[in-house]
Structure formats: structure tokens, C-alpha cells
């Protein structure tokens, strides 16, 4: 039987994955640093824009793919360059925790997209 149209990850699935990779973790990706981003400027693409630069870190690959799928859905997602603090670098774990906090807030308020 034909395969269905690919379902995008849900916000709930993204939250579950972010919880999974941050719980009981002091660090991620050997303490790699990434640019801090303004998550209010399109959170999926903004977070992806920073996290895409992390390689050799299997722990966040699933998160990267989820963000990519969610970012791909947005109209002209590839066109808009999100606001990024080019002068502020933070650890991957901090960015992921910031994303988790932000996404949880969005989820609670029901503004999924």
C-alpha cells in the first residue's frame, strides 16, 4: 500500500526529544559553542541556523532533523535569515535548554506554528 504523506514532527515530539537529550546532562557535544539566537524570530529556523553548524555529535542529530522538518514547512523558510547574536556564543546544551523552555511556553499557550 502507498506510504502516507510524511507527517512533520509535532511540538510535543520535539519537546520529548529536547527533554531526552538535556536530562541529567551538564554538557552536550563536548561543550561545543554555537551562536546565540533570538527564538522569537521563527524558532525552528532560528534554532536550526545555529545548531546546523554542530557536527560529530550524534546526541543532537535527531533534534537537528526535527527542526529541519519543521523549518521546511514554514513559507519561504529558507529565505529568511533569523536574528542571530553574532557576538554571543553559548554552549550547545544552553541553546537546547533555551529552546526547550521556549517551545514548552509555545506549547502551553497553544500557538503551535
Amino acid at each position: 500500500s502507498p506510504s502516507p504523506v510524511t507527517p512533520s514532527p509535532t511540538l510535543k515530539e520535539l519537546i520529548e526529544e529536547l527533554v531526552n537529550i538535556t536530562q541529567n546532562q551538564a554538557s552536550l557535544c563536548n561543550g561545543s559553542m554555537v551562536w546565540s539566537v533570538n527564538l522569537t524570530a521563527g524558532m525552528y529556523c532560528a534554532a536550526l541556523e545555529s545548531l546546523i553548524n554542530v557536527s560529530d555529535c550524534s546526541a543532537i542529530q535527531r533534534t537537528q532533523r526535527m527542526l529541519k522538518a519543521l523549518c521546511s514547512q514554514k513559507p519561504a523558510a529558507g529565505q529568511i535569515s533569523s536574528e542571530r547574536s553574532r557576538d554571543t556564543k553559548i554552549e550547545v546544551i544552553q541553546l537546547v535548554k533555551n529552546l526547550l523552555t521556549y517551545v514548552r511556553g509555545v506549547y502551553r499557550h497553544g500557538n503551535f506554528r
Epitope: N53, R62, R65
Partner: antibody, heavy 119, light 107 residues
Framework: EVQLVQSGAEVKKPGASVKVSCKTS????????MYWVRQAPGAGLEWMGY????????SYNQNFKGRVTLTADKSTSTAYMELSSLRAGDIAVYYC????????????WGQGTLVTVSS | EIVLTQSPASLSLSQEERVTITCKAS??????VAWFQQKPGQAPKALIY???NRYTGVPSRFSGSGSGTDFTLTISSLEPEDVADYFC?????????FGAGTKVELK
Amino acid sequence: EVQLVQSGAEVKKPGASVKVSCKTSGYTFIDYPMYWVRQAPGAGLEWMGYIDPYNGATSYNQNFKGRVTLTADKSTSTAYMELSSLRAGDIAVYYCATAVVATDVMENWGQGTLVTVSS
Amino acid sequence: EIVLTQSPASLSLSQEERVTITCKASQNVRNAVAWFQQKPGQAPKALIYLASNRYTGVPSRFSGSGSGTDFTLTISSLEPEDVADYFCLQHWNYPLTFGAGTKVELK
């Protein structure tokens, strides 16, 4: 050493389905997704989709209009790609591949499986 | 779907000459471009990821550059074993898409 060994060449009739297998070794199967890419004779590369064996999550290229199904068997560390409603335009070498270093950049590839569609 | 336009389609150069292949994306893909080499009858081999990072074991004569929409693969000094097809890939957005390829031959 990462190894991806694919099943042998297939000849199918138009309208039929084909299922290609990709047996893996040398890494933990559930740690990385399995990607499928095809290449028509003398042509470029076309991404078909991926499956994450950890949770069965898939992403498909919608150009295939629901004709592709990707599955993974954790017990044998084997991934499968099934393509239905075959037509002449599906004649190609089909590759499985994994991405370890950079997300979605396939650096370990199977040897390829030639699928021929002929009545 | 993001379209990658690769040029030239083919080129023929002498040994030790410099090879430049370009890949233009239809929209901003940041630095999410990879380059592959494919020899006849073989599977593709990944050379570069995230625009400029060489995979382990890839000779230093291969280098990548660019960001946004314009990317370049350079072979600083062409060797006989570099005769192959070269493809770019964007890995910013799904579906992942490849350029049509560039055939590199020795004069």
C-alpha cells in the same frame, strides 16, 4: 568499519513493487538514520527519504507521491526500501547511506542495487 | 524544493591545473552544502560538509567555500585520480536536493 551491503539486482514488470535491503555492520544501527538515494543511468542523484531506526520516524521526498515505504529491522540491523507502481522512469541504481559526522550528509554508502523495469 | 544549479556541466583540464566548480542555490541555505565525488560504477564519496569542512582522508587539494546561495568546490591541482563526477547537496531543508553534477576530465 561501517559497512552497508545491499541486496542484488532486480528486474520487475511495470506496475509491480520492488523491495531492496541494506544490511549494516560496524556501528550501532539505531544511532543514525538510513537514507535512500537513487541514480538513473547517466543522471544525477535523487534523495528518496530516510528512516530513523531508533523510533521508526520517516521523511519522504514527496516527488515519489507515496510510492516509497522505508522500514528498518532493529533485530538484524537491516533497512528496507520498497517502491511500488514501478514504471520505466524508475530504472536506476538505488543506494542506502548513513550520515554520521554531519546531519543529512551521507558519508557511508552501500554498493548500490540496480532496479530494471521491463515488460 | 530548493534547486541547486551546478556549473559547468563538464570541464577538461590538464594535470596540475586548478579546478573550480560552482553550485548556486535557489534560496538561502546558510552553509549547509556538501560536495561528493563519484567515479564510474562506484557509489558517491563525501568530500566536504557544511560548505568548507573536509572529511577525514580527503586530500587537502580539495576545498570548499561559500555561504547563502553561492558555493564553490576547488581542486587546487588536478590529479589523474580526480577524474570523476562531482555533485553538490543542500542539507538545510527537506527534501534534500543535489546539483545535476559536473564531469571532470583530463585533457
